[in-house]
């Protein structure tokens, strides 16, 4: 039986979760983030094969997001535009995961510090992403049944020299459904 991923100690070391990232903001947008076959990223009202995502910890508090169906990594340009890439560029495709008190998560580009915003449905990946919702509710997907794609970066150990070696300090200490088994 797999160890549930609710422990903050499992936030690093290659921990893998399958999730749908759902968002509902004040502008009547309700959508699941999906990474499409052509590399575009958008929102779908319903859960779909393209919206099932694999979230894998790279180091404390930092994850990569992989579209399970399309085998594309979620990445972000310096202007905030999202795209799905076949190649994992750690500087474009690594996101800091911040847990909020209400169960939602916020994701920020580790390199640029920009929050992950869901682009409009018709926004091509090469256009700057319009401002969309930045809070995502990670909904459990199916447990990983297929062997995971080869890791690009070896998981890094906790930064023992840091005052926050496990990246525990964030907007809150609240437990997110992202870590529900």
């Amino acid at each position: 039986h797999p160890i549930p991923d609710s422990s903050p100690l499992l936030q690093f070391g290659g921990q893998v979760r399958q999730r749908y990232l759902y968002t509902d903001d004040a502008q009547q947008t309700e959508a699941h983030l999906e990474i499409r076959e052509d590399g575009t990223v958008g929102g779908a009202a319903d859960q779909s094969p393209e919206s099932l995502l694999q979230l894998k910890a790279l180091k404390p508090g930092v994850i990569q997001i992989l579209g399970v169906k399309t085998s594309r990594f979620l990445c972000q340009r310096p202007d905030g535009a999202l795209y799905g890439s076949l190649h994992f560029d750690p500087e474009a495709c690594s996101f800091r995961e911040l847990l909020l008190e209400d169960g939602y998560n916020v994701y920020q580009s580790e390199a640029h510090g920009l929050p992950l915003h869901l682009p409009g449905n018709k926004s091509p990946h090469r256009d700057p992403a319009p401002r969309g919702p930045a809070r995502f509710l990670p909904l459990p997907g199916l447990p990983p049944a297929l062997p995971e794609p080869p890791g690009i970066l070896a998981p890094q150990p906790p930064d023992v020299g840091s005052s926050d070696p496990l990246s525990m300090v964030g907007p809150s200490q609240g437990r997110s459904p992202s870590y529900a088994s």
Epitope: G39, S71, L86, H87, P90, A92, R126, P149, I152
Partner: antibody, heavy 119, light 110 residues
Framework: EVKLVESGGDLVKPGGSLKLSCAAS????????MSWVRQTPDKRLEWVAT????????YYPDSVKGRFTISRDNAKNTLYLQMSSLRSEDTAMYYC????????????WGTGTTVTVSS | QIVLTQSPAIMSAPLGERVTMTCTAS???????LHWYQQKPGSSPKVWIY???NLASGVPTRFSGSGSGTSYSLTISSMEAEDAATYYC???????????FGGGTKLEIK
């Protein structure tokens, strides 16, 4: 217009060093992975080096690992290739190439610069 | 490391003829990772077909690409003079990241 222009190619003796530059224009340089690809005199294409968008991650084939170093200056929109311990088999036309954002094939190529290694 | 072998190395075809060239991988390659480039003498390579079947911008519709696993091909439905060039297949491997080219097929007019 999206453009890549290489420079720095020269005739150099075996064991020597050379630094190539590639000036990029017409696109947001810092958004793209970049590579060097060379074409040998027999017209074969060989991937030489790749660098991530921010420059922190680099990749090389075994044939140049430890001898070549790829780097970039996003503020100057310039890509570099430092070559050392050059061998005769490094003689080639060197192209700077941009990676497509989503599929990572080489979607834009420069005009190339010639490196000849000979005594 | 995957090796890409292109055949034939050189071929000639009369104008109007259907042309097919192949690219064989030493082990299976995802169709998303297989691309083709065209190069004419004195010019840099240009992406011609990406992800096995998708024509790059400006590529005539007489070109097509197909394949899966270890066998891929580029086809010209009706050879035209401007198609005379060398075509290279190219593969991306995800982990560790590497990029490999085939030896090329030189297409001439008969």
């Amino acid at each position: 217009e999206v453009k890549l222009v290489e420079s720095g190619g020269d005739l150099v003796k075996p064991g020597g060093s050379l630094k190539l530059s590639c000036a990029a224009s017409g696109f947001t340089f810092s958004s793209y992975g970049m590579s060097w690809v060379r074409q040998t005199p027999d017209k074969r294409l060989e991937w030489v080096a790749t660098i991530s968008t921010g420059g922190g991650y680099t990749y090389y084939p075994d044939s140049v690992k430890g001898r070549f170093t790829i780097s970039r200056d996003n503020a100057k929109n310039t890509l570099y290739l430092q070559m050392s311990s050059l061998r005769s088999e490094d003689t080639a036309m060197y192209y700077c190439a941009r990676h497509d954002l989503v599929d990572w094939y080489f979607d834009v190529w420069g005009t190339g610069t010639t490196v000849t290694v000979s005594s | 490391q995957i090796v890409l072998t292109q055949s034939p190395a050189i071929m000639s075809a009369p104008l109007g003829e259907r042309v097919t060239m192949t690219c064989t991988a030493s082990s299976s390659v995802s169709s998303s990772y297989l691309h083709w480039y065209q190069q004419k003498p004195g010019s840099s390579p240009k992406v011609w077909i990406y992800r096995t079947t998708n024509l790059a911008s400006g590529v005539p519709t007489r070109f097509s690409g197909s394949g899966s696993g270890t066998s891929y091909s580029l086809t010209i439905s009706s050879m035209e003079a401007e198609d005379a060039a060398t075509y290279y297949c190219h593969q991306y491997h995800r982990s560790p990241p590497t990029w490999t080219f085939g030896g090329g097929t030189k297409l001439e007019i008969k």
